[in-house]
């Protein structure tokens, strides 16, 4: 795979021999679009090109993560003279073209947003008729997905010397602040771990030593809301039982 910005054939320069329109290849995308998880977002992308009145076959492509090499999340193709761009790929069926590529608009709608959609997206157009030419946005649009906190895991685990520790993992954007409360604890921020590499929206808080039986509650909060979950510690006959 050659990481090229544009692949061209030799005949593309003759399109301007007799006229010199001011347009050249360019793409316009905003730096960032924000939306809440569960909602839909529109990723705007418009372009200009030097091939006047191009009416041949074209393909519109969106990719995620990185330009030129990132995985495609959407692709559609329009036949010569057609304004209908037939979808060939829509990852999980959630991506839909809003714009009309014939009118230099590749804007994309993303449905049912999840935190995993928080990435940079790059639009690309390919001409494949008398003219072979293509162009891809180099800087892309960052889709910033926000979400109220959700506790994805809460558990009690054995520690050395017959002790127990509790772990609470939550997701959200902005990353939520976690606090533990429980017997003889009051409220404690309890060793919050930074978001992990590749899991930027996950935050974990550990309660290193559970000294009393009872209910331990983890609360996750950010500017969009709060969530809580509890575990119960009962020690009997030297063993432990934990339930949520």
């Amino acid at each position: 795979f050659v990481r090229t910005k544009i692949d061209t054939t030799e005949n593309l320069l003759n399109t301007e021999v007799h006229s010199s329109p001011a347009q050249r290849w360019s793409m316009q995308v905003p730096p960032e679009v924000s939306a809440e998880a569960g909602d839909a977002a529109v990723l705007p992308c418009t372009f200009t090109h030097p091939h006047r009145h191009y009416d041949g076959p074209l393909t519109a492509i969106w990719r995620a993560g990185e330009p030129y090499a990132g995985p495609q999340v959407f692709r559609c193709a329009a036949a010569r003279g057609s304004e209908l761009c037939q979808t060939a790929l829509s990852l999980h069926g959630r991506f839909r073209l809003l714009g009309n590529p014939r009118r230099n608009d590749l804007s994309l709608r993303v449905e049912r947003l999840a935190l995993a959609d928080d990435r940079r997206y790059f639009c690309r157009v390919e001409f494949a008729g008398d003219v072979h030419d293509r162009y891809e946005s180099r800087h892309g649009v960052r889709l910033h997905v926000t979400a109220a906190p959700r506790i994805v895991n809460i558990s009690v685990l054995p520690s050395p010397a017959h002790a127990f520790r509790a772990l609470c993992t939550a997701e959200g954007e902005p990353p939520p602040a976690l606090a533990w409360s429980g017997p003889a604890l009051g409220n404690s921020l309890a060793a919050v771990r930074s978001p992990r590499e590749g899991h930027g929206h996950l935050v974990t808080a550990e309660l290193p030593a559970l000294t009393h039986d009872g209910r331990y509650t983890c609360t996750a909060a950010n500017s969009l809301g709060r969530s809580e979950a509890s575990v119960y510690l009962f020690r009997f006959h030297g063993a432990s039982g934990a339930s949520t």
Epitope: I6, R24, W25, S26, A69, D133, H139
Partner: antibody
């Protein structure tokens, strides 16, 4: 504000490898970055570029000798040019591409002389 | 050709208008950017894309493009505009960047 600072040895022997780094401060490294060089008294020559995701493109005539990489954790990029000759003597600049093919921020440049 | 060609030198009287050109087949497809470089300094972006002035650039600088030629015009040249000016764009394949050879602008008077 965003600043770029190139660093590396000012003198490299012929046939050896030229290694330079560019420290990015005052902003995220999330962008496209290029290395450009300028031989004494001459014009600018684009060497290649790297995206913060690791994607690279190089000038074809230099491609066999050049490697550009990015270290997101250190907020820096690097240039390696192998098998250097006197023709590689130049001021080497790193620059940020803020819009397609347009560089708005440049480092001050570092002079590299290839000589035995 | 993937080259961008500039005239090596041009002079202009103080307060007058000067036009610097950059020629190349790739300019039929891609916009050019323009940079000013003073002695012992790094280049500074002046104009990018169709005719966008970079931050802090006076409005006496403007850009245009027609056919295979991009132009940088300085209307009412000042003494501080004396510098080398370089254009850049993609090559005809679009796969990599090229710079013009540069034009040395001398402001007289």
């Amino acid at each position: 504000q965003l600043q770029l600072q190139e660093s590396g040895p000012g003198l490299v022997k012929p046939s050896e490898t030229l290694s330079l780094t560019c420290a990015v401060s005052g902003a995220s490294i999330s962008n496209w970055w290029s290395w450009v060089r300028q031989p004494p008294g001459k014009g600018l020559e684009w060497i290649g570029e790297v995206h913060h995701s690791g994607v690279t493109t190089y000038k074809p005539s230099l491609k066999s000798r050049v490697t550009i990489s990015v270290d997101n954790s250190k907020n820096q990029l690097s240039l390696k040019l192998t098998s250097v000759t006197a023709a590689d003597t130049a001021v080497y600049y790193c620059a940020r591409e803020f819009a397609d093919d347009a560089f708005d921020i440049w480092g001050r440049g570092t002079m590299v002389t290839v000589s035995s | 050709s993937s080259e961008l060609t500039q005239d090596p030198a041009v002079s202009v009287a103080l307060g007058q208008t000067v036009r610097i050109t950059c020629r190349g087949d790739s300019l039929r497809k891609y916009y050019a950017s323009w940079y000013q470089q003073k002695p012992r300094q790094a280049p500074q972006l002046v104009i990018y894309h169709k005719n966008n002035r970079a931050s802090g650039i006076p409005d006496r600088f403007s850009g245009s493009i027609s056919g295979n030629t991009a132009s940088l015009t300085i209307t009412g040249a000042q003494a501080e505009d004396e510098a080398a000016y370089f254009c850049n764009s993609r090559d005809t394949s679009g796969n990599y960047l090229v710079f013009g050879g540069g034009t040395k602008v001398t402001v007289l008077g």
